[in-house]
Interface confidence: medium
C-alpha cells in the first residue's frame, strides 16, 4: 500500500469572529472561546485552532472559557459559560450567547 500523503489541518469548523474569512475555516481542530473583558458582556468566538493546543486543557475562569473539538463542524452548536464567581443575579455566561 502506498503511504498516504501527510496532511496539514483537516477539520472544517464553523467560523464566527472578526477574524473569519468566511462562515467556515479549516484547522487542526475547532474552537469555541468565550471571553469577558473588564466591564463588557462576554463574547463567544468560533473558529479553528492550529497552534497552542494546551489552551484547550485550561479550566474555565470568570474571564475565559476555551473549548476544542476535533470533528467536522463540531463547534457549531456549542455554548459555553464562564466560571460563576459573582452573585447569582449577574450570570456572565448567559450574556451575549
Amino acid at each position: 500500500d502506498p503511504v498516504k500523503p501527510s496532511r496539514g489541518p483537516l477539520v472544517t469548523c464553523t467560523c464566527e469572529s472578526p477574524h473569519c474569512k468566511g462562515p467556515t475555516c479549516r484547522g487542526a481542530w475547532c474552537t469555541v472561546v468565550l471571553v469577558r473583558e473588564e466591564g463588557r458582556h462576554p463574547q463567544e468566538h468560533r473558529g479553528c485552532g492550529n497552534l497552542h493546543r494546551e489552551l484547550c486543557r485550561g479550566r474555565p475562569t470568570e474571564f475565559v472559557n476555551h473549548y476544542c473539538c476535533d470533528s467536522h463542524l463540531c463547534n457549531h452548536n456549542v455554548s459555553l459559560v464562564l466560571e460563576a464567581t459573582q452573585p447569582p443575579s449577574e450570570q456572565p455566561g448567559t450574556d451575549g450567547q
Epitope: 500523503p5 501527510s6 496532511r7 496539514g8 483537516l10 479549516r26 497552534l51
Partner: antibody, heavy 119, light 107 residues
Framework: EVQLVESGGGLVKPGGSLRLSCAAS????????MSWVRQAPGKGLEWVGR??????????DYAAPVKGRFTISRDDSKNTLYLQMNSLKTEDTAVYYC??????????WGQGTLVTVSS | ETTLTQSPAFMSATPGDKVNISCKAS??????MNWYQQKPGEAAIFIIQ???TLVPGIPPRFSGSGYGTDFTLTINNIESEDAAYYFC?????????FGGGTKVEIK
C-alpha cells in the same frame, strides 16, 4: 475573502527559466500548506507540488515530471508563494494555478497564469 | 500512480434534470476523493470532500457518493448557474491526480 493572485507567466524559450508568484490574502498564509497545479491546453489538471507551513517543517513535495527542475518556496512576511521553473520544456506549457488547503485538499484556487514554452 | 477516469467528458442538461458524473480510480482509494467546480475565467470551487461530505456553503442539490474505486457527483434539479467544468481529485497517494474533467452545458 480569500484571494490568490498568480503572476509572472509569459513566453519563454525551451531551456529557459521563469518565476511565478502567488499573492495571498484573506487568511493566515503562514499556517497554510500551499500547492501549485497546472493545466496544459486541452488537457486535464496536473498536480505540480506543494510546500508545508514553516511550523510543519516547510518541506516540499513534487510531481515526477518537474522534480529537480521546479522549486516551490514561500515568503510568509510577504504572504507570497513562488514557483521557480528552470530547464523549461515545451510540455510545461500550461495555466499554472496556486491553491491553498491542507496539502491534499485544495480549498481555494487562484485564476491562474499562462506559461508558454516555445521557440 | 492512481489514474482517475472521469465520464462523461461532456454533457448537456435541461434545468431541473438530475445529473451524474462518474470518476473511477485505478486502485482502491478509500474515501479520499474530492470534487471541484470551475467556471470559465473564474477560480475553481471546492464542492465535495471525502467523497460524500458537502463543503459548507455549497447548495444541497450537490451530493457525492462512492467508496474504493467508484465515485459519483450528483447534481439534483440542476440550474443554469451550474454550467461549468467539474473535476475529481484523489488524495490517497502521491502524486495527487485529477480526473479528465466533465463540461456540463445547460440547454
Amino acid at each position: 475573502e480569500v484571494q490568490l493572485v498568480e503572476s509572472g507567466g509569459g513566453l519563454v524559450k525551451p531551456g529557459g527559466s521563469l518565476r511565478l508568484s502567488c499573492a495571498a490574502s484573506g487568511f493566515t498564509f503562514s499556517n497554510a500548506w500551499m500547492s501549485w497545479v497546472r493545466q496544459a491546453p486541452g488537457k486535464g489538471l496536473e498536480w505540480v507540488g506543494r510546500i508545508k507551513s514553516k511550523t510543519d517543517g516547510g518541506t516540499t513535495d513534487y510531481a515526477a515530471p518537474v522534480k529537480g527542475r521546479f522549486t516551490i518556496s514561500r515568503d510568509d512576511s510577504k504572504n507570497t508563494l513562488y514557483l521557480q521553473m528552470n530547464s523549461l520544456k515545451t510540455e510545461d506549457t500550461a495555466v499554472y494555478y496556486c491553491t491553498t488547503g491542507d496539502g491534499t485538499h485544495f480549498d481555494y484556487w487562484g485564476q491562474g497564469t499562462l506559461v508558454t514554452v516555445s521557440s | 500512480e492512481t489514474t482517475l477516469t472521469q465520464s462523461p467528458a461532456f454533457m448537456s442538461a435541461t434545468p431541473g434534470d438530475k445529473v451524474n458524473i462518474s470518476c473511477k480510480a485505478s486502485q482502491d482509494i478509500d474515501d479520499d476523493m474530492n470534487w471541484y467546480q470551475q467556471k470559465p475565467g473564474e477560480a475553481a470551487i471546492f464542492i465535495i470532500q471525502e467523497a460524500t461530505t458537502l463543503v459548507p456553503g455549497i447548495p444541497p442539490r450537490f451530493s457525492g457518493s462512492g467508496y474504493g474505486t467508484d465515485f459519483t457527483l450528483t447534481i439534483n434539479n440542476i440550474e443554469s448557474e451550474d454550467a461549468a467544468y467539474y473535476f475529481c481529485l484523489q488524495h490517497d497517494n502521491f502524486p495527487l491526480t485529477f480526473g479528465g474533467g466533465t463540461k456540463v452545458e445547460i440547454k
